[in-house]
């Protein structure tokens, strides 16, 4: 069908609550484009009827709420005047009862669910709530070990919980809760956050921390387009460079002629006492020569790699 496939990272989500994912891919969605969502390679688009539990809302796919059976690969097709891209998003839904068990045992949790407070400082936690404009979010309540947080040192500021004079006792399992209103109906959103305490001044001293990748392999089909983010946390005043290298050479230099593999534009999100940086690497078309080669994300003195590998043959097809 002439659409270029792009594989995004997995999202691990909690059942029985709202979830939304925005189909944005800056090089493409910045212009005049149409966006259509599909599930599991279905030819039938996701409904745009706002009363549907799962529906498309502008560029978003919205689940009101998410259910256990919603796990799967969703595709959003971005069509421009002269281009077509199909972005694959793997959603995994789990049953999570925040008060029963620790969030710590879950695989691949994003940085949003693991946050750090700095001992002896004033710091904050952030409740990440990403929903389209049609969703109205009420005031956020915060919980620690399933008890609502109240006390002298805690103040709520929009999506943040301000914590004064952080102590070692502040580590643990937190949750932020908000009531989401959509088309007159109310839903509860509850995000779990595992909080650790660091004694180091600044955000981990001057050594940046690479959150992703984690020195692992990625299965990817030959000929596909692949985008991999490198997520780095570092101090706000850092002077570290972040980049992707292969064979100890900047990817933009290594693939200077073909431009088949490129480093993306760095973006960052500013937290109270650290920045979260993202710089991606784009494989426009994965070739045989890419397999088995470590693609290194560098951030100051820190490094982490990904290695592409061919998926194992699926014998069920025969």
């Amino acid at each position: 069908d002439g659409c270029k496939d792009i594989f995004m990272k997995n999202e691990i989500l909690s059942a029985s609550q709202p979830f939304a994912f925005n189909c944005t891919f800056p090089p493409i969605t910045s212009g005049e484009v149409s966006v259509t969502w599909y599930k599991n390679s279905s030819k039938i688009p996701v409904s745009k009827i706002i009363q549907s539990r799962i529906h498309q809302d502008e560029t978003w796919i919205l689940f009101l709420p998410m259910e256990w059976g919603d796990s799967g690969v969703y595709q959003c097709v971005i069509k421009g005047r002269d281009s077509c891209h199909r972005i694959h998003v793997n959603l995994t839904v789990f049953e999570k009862h925040w008060c029963d068990t620790s969030i710590g045992g879950l695989p691949n949790l994003s940085d949003e669910y693991k946050q750090i407070l700095h001992l002896g400082k004033d710091d904050s936690l952030t409740c990440h709530l990403h929903f389209p404009k049609s969703c109205v979010l009420g005031p956020i309540k915060w919980y620690k070990d399933c008890n609502e947080i109240k006390g002298e040192r805690f103040t709520v500021l929009e999506t943040r919980l301000l914590v004064s004079n952080v102590s070692a006792e502040d580590r643990g399992n937190y949750a932020c809760q908000a009531i989401l209103t959509h088309s007159g109906k109310q839903y509860e959103v509850l995000n779990g956050i595992t909080v650790s305490i660091t004694e180091r001044a600044g955000y981990g001293g001057s050594v940046p921390k690479i959150i992703y990748p984690k020195n692992h392999s990625i299965e990817v089909q030959l000929g596909t387009t692949l985008i991999v983010d490198c997520n780095v946390t570092d101090t706000k005043d850092n002077t570290n460079l972040r980049c992707w290298r292969v064979n100890n050479t900047l990817v933009d230099d290594y693939y200077d002629e073909s431009k088949r593999i490129r480093e993306g534009v760095e973006t960052h999100v500013s937290f109270r006492e650290h920045n979260l940086y993202t710089v991606n690497i784009t494989f426009l078309e994965v070739k045989m020569e890419d397999y088995g080669l470590p693609f290194m994300c560098h951030a100051g003195v820190s490094t982490a790699y990904i290695i592409l590998q061919l998926p194992a043959p699926d014998f069920r097809a025969y």
Epitope: D122, G151, E152, F154, T155, L157, K236, R272
Partner: antibody, heavy 119, light 107 residues
Amino acid sequence: QVQLQESGPGLVAPSETLSLTCTVSGFSLTDYAVHWIRQFPGKGLEWIGVIWSDGSTDFNAPFKSRVTISKDTSKNQVSFKLSSVTTDDTAVYYCARKGGYSGSWFAYWGQGTLVTVSS
Amino acid sequence: EIVMTQSPATLSVSPGVRATLSCKASQDVGTNVLWYQQKPGQAPRPLIYSASYRHSGIPDRFSGSGSGTEFTLTISSLQSEDFAVYYCQQYSRYPLTFGQGTKLEIK
């Protein structure tokens, strides 16, 4: 000891920008946030906004489009600007700081500076 | 935003007598309430934080109580220097908000 002192013109014309400076001593702006509060002639107090130790800012919703807060850490100064003022902005303006171990309340205040908006 | 309502607006009391000031929050603020005292030409001065804890240097004739939505400041035996305006402030949730004040005047 911890001190904060506001300074700036006492008279501002309507539609102009009100500019104030808070000069601090006894602590570093890289360690503590500085808040701005105003008090109307009728005595009501209103929290306007804050510049955090990392330089980020937050504002009370009615002020988001009109207020700018910045700082020069080396000079121990915080700058406050309120644009498009009207006579309703006539008030005493305070800068303030929380206590070392306290929550979000103000243990230390400047002496305040009266700003009158009038043509 | 959370609205803080103080009563009465003015309280006329004789020196040596007990004074009780009230502050109500429009929603639950736990104990994140502070009382300030303000005299003419001066900045507010913190008296009681966390609803019932005296700030450093505050005489023990000042006491605070309450939680949730209802709070009280009590001055057990009024001294001449206590006649001033008193404000409550909540710091449970931004925007930080203040009561409109209670003026304590000599009867």
